[in-house]
Amino acid sequence: ASTQSPSVFPLTRCCKNIPSNATSVTLGCLATGYFPEPVMVTWDTGSLNGTTMTLPATTLTLSGHYATISLLTVSGAWAKQMFTCRVAHTPSSTDWVDNKTFSVCSRDFTPPTVKILQSSCDGGGHFPPTIQLLCLVSGYTPGTINITWLEDGQVMDVDLSTASTTQEGELASTQSELTLSQKHWLSDRTYTCQVTYQGHTFEDSTKKCADSNPRGVSAYLSRPSPFDLFIRKSPTITCLVVDLAPSKGTVNLTWSRASGKPVNHSTRKEEKQRNGTLTVTSTLPVGTRDWIEGETYQCRVTHPHLPRALMRSTTKTSGPRAAPEVYAFATPEWPGSRDKRTLACLIQNFMPEDISVQWLHNEVQLPDARHSTTQPRKTKGSGFFVFSRLEVTRAEWEQKDEFICRAVHEAASPSQTVQRAVSVNPGLAGGSAQSQRAPDRVLCHSGQQQGLPRAAGGSVPHPRCHCGAGRADWPGPPELDVCVEEAEGEAPWTWTGLC
């Protein structure tokens, strides 16, 4: 085991358990968790005589480190006396020492609450020439307290004679004031009011707030899209920082990897927003294999208005995997829009939520701008679903009436893709869609599970999704059915399927 210095704890009895006529009392000091042997324990008993006994060290089973107890027995006027136990551990360093000063016994007490209040700015929101900090030490069992002011952790030379104590019932409160020059306050130093009471330390700290709230600067780190990862095989991750005060380019974005390996060269883009803020994006190419094998990537953001750097990290999603189910539908013709149709694609029950959706026509992928795809949402089970919507023109379907909705997802096999074809005019029994009027919408109440109409022509609907009663001018049973799930508190989403 490597060298380890001890932790030192005072050992005292409760005052109420010591008889008032006791002529001598014993207190102790525990030194624990040190390695190697030995420790040296000495006592400062002030004006009193005492006898000490240090017990042999014992080995702590799990760590192999040592613990020892030193006992001090004193007689005389011990009640008002403070005792210091001094523990030295020369293996840690020749001057390693820890002192603990405490009284013979511990009282039941209510600890203080420590709170720093600061003086207000002037009417114009500016700082006055001097700033007052008020340390309120409240609600403690009356007894001796020591107040110390620290500036960036260093003890300040402050006149504490101004501290005043008041008693409210059985509890006491004390306050201490610190006056600072504007220069010191604006220097961004941290001021601490430290209270020592009954051998314990309580404190509160404050510093000047940022000059202006940076409107909640936020950073986001995306994972690579499955399309970039599995199809293009050139994955990238993007660190996005929004709501920055511009400060003319002093925002820094730094990339790193948890493994410590070097990162590729990133590309950076800045955009000025109409709300006066800057949006910065940094895009980093990552290795396909590195990502799949679980490498973690970190983006670190520094900026003058951030009190500390923002860190964001991303890695491959863990957890169960499930391949997506893909259903594609065409809407019937709508009066007044003979030359346009909407195609819909429901992709559901996939895990994790990372998915890319594409539409193809004539074996050519359509631009992403052509379709609109929702963000993944959780299903009632454990998976996710998305909808994708594509508007197509008569010219397109007359050229070739087959459109493909493709989902790219890591759990899809064999090649991380699942796709379904859909036609605008699937050649229905009872007439083609464009020559018939659409049936009434059918509201689909499904209980536990939303019913899905089947995509294949002529098949029956899901048992939980009944077909509508049809209309007088509809020849025979309705062939088309619109299912609507009325999600609570949200706009319903719909799709059209075949009954």
Epitope: D211, T250, T277, P304
Partner: antibody
Framework: QVQLVQSGAEVKKPGASVKVSCKAS????????ISWVRQAPGQGLEWMGW????????NYAQKLQGRITMTTDTSTSTAYMELRSLRSDDTAVYYC????????????WGQGTLVTVSS | DIQMTQSPSSLSASVGDRVTITCRAS??????LNWYQQKPGKAPKLLIY???SLKSGVPSRFSGSESGTDFTLTISSLQPEDFATYYC?????????FGQGTKVEIK
Amino acid sequence: QVQLVQSGAEVKKPGASVKVSCKASGYTFTSYGISWVRQAPGQGLEWMGWISAYNGNTNYAQKLQGRITMTTDTSTSTAYMELRSLRSDDTAVYYCARDGDYYDPFDYWGQGTLVTVSS
Amino acid sequence: DIQMTQSPSSLSASVGDRVTITCRASQSISNWLNWYQQKPGKAPKLLIYGASSLKSGVPSRFSGSESGTDFTLTISSLQPEDFATYYCQQSYSTPPTFGQGTKVEIK
């Protein structure tokens, strides 16, 4: 309140250098950038460059590249602008200005330092 | 660099008048436009930032608006202390550039 106090007027000969100081108070110096803007007699305003008091990054106007250096001393909350190889057309009032938060305006200005370049 | 063109270069007006100064950017600057007031022998003072946001402490008679690449500073009722030179400035791209100024004089 926010204040920028500049050094006094200077008279320089052509070819010499001038260094103007700008002492900031009333805000956290390192949280804002400082720009320098000059104004020739009877003319408009011309941006000369900018320095981040946070990390010392600088950005200079192209026409002054090589002749201008901006620095800061965070211990005294002071920004400096040095212009070398002075010419008569460098005669102007030189202002330091703090870059504001949103939309990057120059939200507080120093009182100006007149630099006269004359042989 | 983005050019900022201010008009008029000077105007005469009386106390109580409504005064309008326009500024045109040579390319899109979104709403990243600021207006300053400068009095003789003094440093400029920020009046409006982000095309229409009034700086704290500036009288509400000053207002700003935008229409594409055209920006307007309006003084609803001119006061004696408003006689000065006004500059627009774009902060959308580096270098920041100023208009040539509009001098508002007493009629």
